[in-house]
Interface confidence: medium
């Protein structure tokens, strides 16, 4: 019995369906086929869980969190024992193993391993201003999303005709910050932060209004 090499890892967006491949060759009929799918969750590597089981011509549920979401992609018994996971959750991220036995065919590699990563688009980022908005001051525009796998990068732009940040601005796309030094009335305007990763984007807006000093009346 020989389980075929499977792709090292699979990525899927949260809520979508993941298909975990596992196929094998065997010299025996599939009368005594026994298939166990196990997962070692990334969130709890010390606690492997059963995903689904095929034994004695019957299918059995694995851990409760997989109930109703997991099944074999084809009619069993078969030499393709790939499974699907519907409505993928962040907690489904982990290393999946298919263990195949088909007596009397013994020997050979009977385990296939596939990594699953569930990706999450950035949640709506939070935009805020740090520092005084008085003319001549330095301000920092902050942007961050609570969720996002892989970790989002942040892109700031000024929503005017040029879209460019002021010349005195420095942008950090990883941290989501823009530092604008020595702000002037020309710095005023609507700024947009875009959080993005491999599977999605999300935006927030910030209105920066630079405060000019009030002329003092000399009595």
């Amino acid at each position: 019995l020989e389980v075929s090499e499977s792709p090292g890892s699979i990525q899927v967006a949260r809520g979508q369906t993941a298909v975990l491949p596992c196929t094998f060759t065997t010299s025996a009929a599939l009368i005594n086929l026994n298939v166990i799918w196990m997962v070692t969750p990334l969130s709890n590597a010390n606690q492997p869980e059963q995903v689904i089981l095929y034994q004695g011509g019957q299918m059995f549920d694995g851990a409760p969190r997989f109930h109703g979401r997991v099944g074999f992609t084809g009619t069993m018994p078969a030499t393709n024992v790939s499974v699907f996971i519907n409505n993928t959750q962040l907690s489904d991220t982990g290393t999946y193993q298919c263990l195949v036995n088909n007596l009397p065919d013994i020997g050979g590699r009977n385990i296939g391993v596939t990594g699953l990563t569930v990706l999450v688009p950035p949640s709506a980022p939070h935009c805020q201003i740090q520092g005084s908005q008085d003319i001549g001051s330095d301000v920092i525009l902050l942007c961050s999303s609570e969720e996002g796998i892989p970790r989002p990068t942040y892109l700031w732009e000024k929503l005017d005709n040029t879209l460019k940040l002021p010349p005195t601005a420095t942008q950090d796309q990883v941290q989501g910050t823009v530092t604008i030094r020595n702000i002037s009335t020309l710095t005023s305007g609507l700024y947009q932060c875009v959080a993005s990763n491999a599977i999605g984007t999300s935006t927030c807006l910030l209105d920066l209004q630079v405060i000019s000093p009030q002329p003092r009346n000399i009595g």
Epitope: A13, P121, A124, T153, L155, E157, L159, D160, N161, T162, L163, K164, Q192, V194, A195, S196, A198, I199, G200, T201, S202, T203
Partner: antibody
Framework: EVQLVESGGGLVKPGGSLRLSCAAS????????MSWVRQAPGKGLEWVGR??????????DYAAPVKGRFTISRDDSKNTLYLQMNSLKTEDTAVYYC??????????????WGQGTLVTVSS | SYELTQPPSVSVSPGQTASITCSGD??????ASWYQQKPGQSPVLVIY???KRPSGIPERFSGSNSGNTATLTISGTQAEDEADYYC???????????FGGGTKLTVL
């Protein structure tokens, strides 16, 4: 893997209509700003229009040559972008690409692009 | 309407540095992007926001933009870099992209 697949191209007579589709996969389509770009045979790229995500208002903008004739729409439940082309002219003959606005916003560039679908306007 | 001008063709020897220019009125005040298109293929974004590289684009691709000119530089040019290159500007906030006429890069 992020993928865009266009369909619906073909031969149409001047004054006729055609609807192009772009099926998206591998990313959260509903969050994405999407765009159409065309390329006449042997010529350069020409921006056609763009639609924002519904969360960003879902508004559309168009290039001057197609404004009033072309309409961009989206069906987030089907992960599909559309380009409805009416009152077609011979100069609309081109390969039409759909593309994702890569980093959101206006300045993030277009990435990836679909494989394109050819629209031929001829009598 | 806003126009971007590129040289129709640029030639470079393998391993040398290729520079492709794109000019437009006060282009440096706007953001520039660059796209690579190989024959029979769809365009690929190689530079956005003047000088930022998308993931998967080799480090030999770089960009700059000031005054009236944006420049795409390919250092240590390889045969696989032979393609058409298009510059693009964001135009106004309602015009997502204005494209240049394209430059054919030939690696001799």
């Amino acid at each position: 893997e992020v993928q865009l697949v266009e369909s619906g191209g073909g031969l149409v007579k001047p004054g006729g209509s055609l609807r192009l589709s772009c099926a998206a996969s591998g990313f959260t389509f509903s969050n994405a700003w999407m765009s159409w770009v065309r390329q006449a045979p042997g010529k350069g790229l020409e921006w056609v229009g763009r639609i924002k995500s519904k969360t960003d208002g879902g508004t559309t903008d168009y290039a001057a040559p197609v404004k009033g004739r072309f309409t961009i729409s989206r069906d987030d439940s089907k992960n599909t972008l559309y380009l409805q082309m009416n009152s077609l002219k011979t100069e609309d003959t081109a390969v039409y690409y759909c593309a994702r606005v890569a980093h959101g916003g206006y300045s993030g560039g277009l990435d990836p692009w679909g494989q394109g679908t050819l629209v031929t306007v001829s009598s | 309407s806003y126009e971007l001008t590129q040289p129709p063709s640029v030639s470079v020897s393998p391993g040398q540095t290729a520079s492709i220019t794109c000019s437009g009125d006060k282009l440096g005040d706007k953001y520039a992007s660059w796209y690579q298109q190989k024959p029979g293929q769809s365009p690929v974004l190689v530079i956005y926001q003047d000088s930022k590289r998308p993931s998967g684009i080799p480090e030999r691709f770089s960009g700059s933009n000031s005054g009236n000119t944006a420049t795409l530089t390919i250092s240590g040019t390889q045969a696989e870099d032979e393609a058409d290159y298009y510059c693009s500007s964001t135009g106004t906030a309602h015009t997502l992209a204005v494209f240049g006429g394209g430059t054919k890069l030939t690696v001799l």
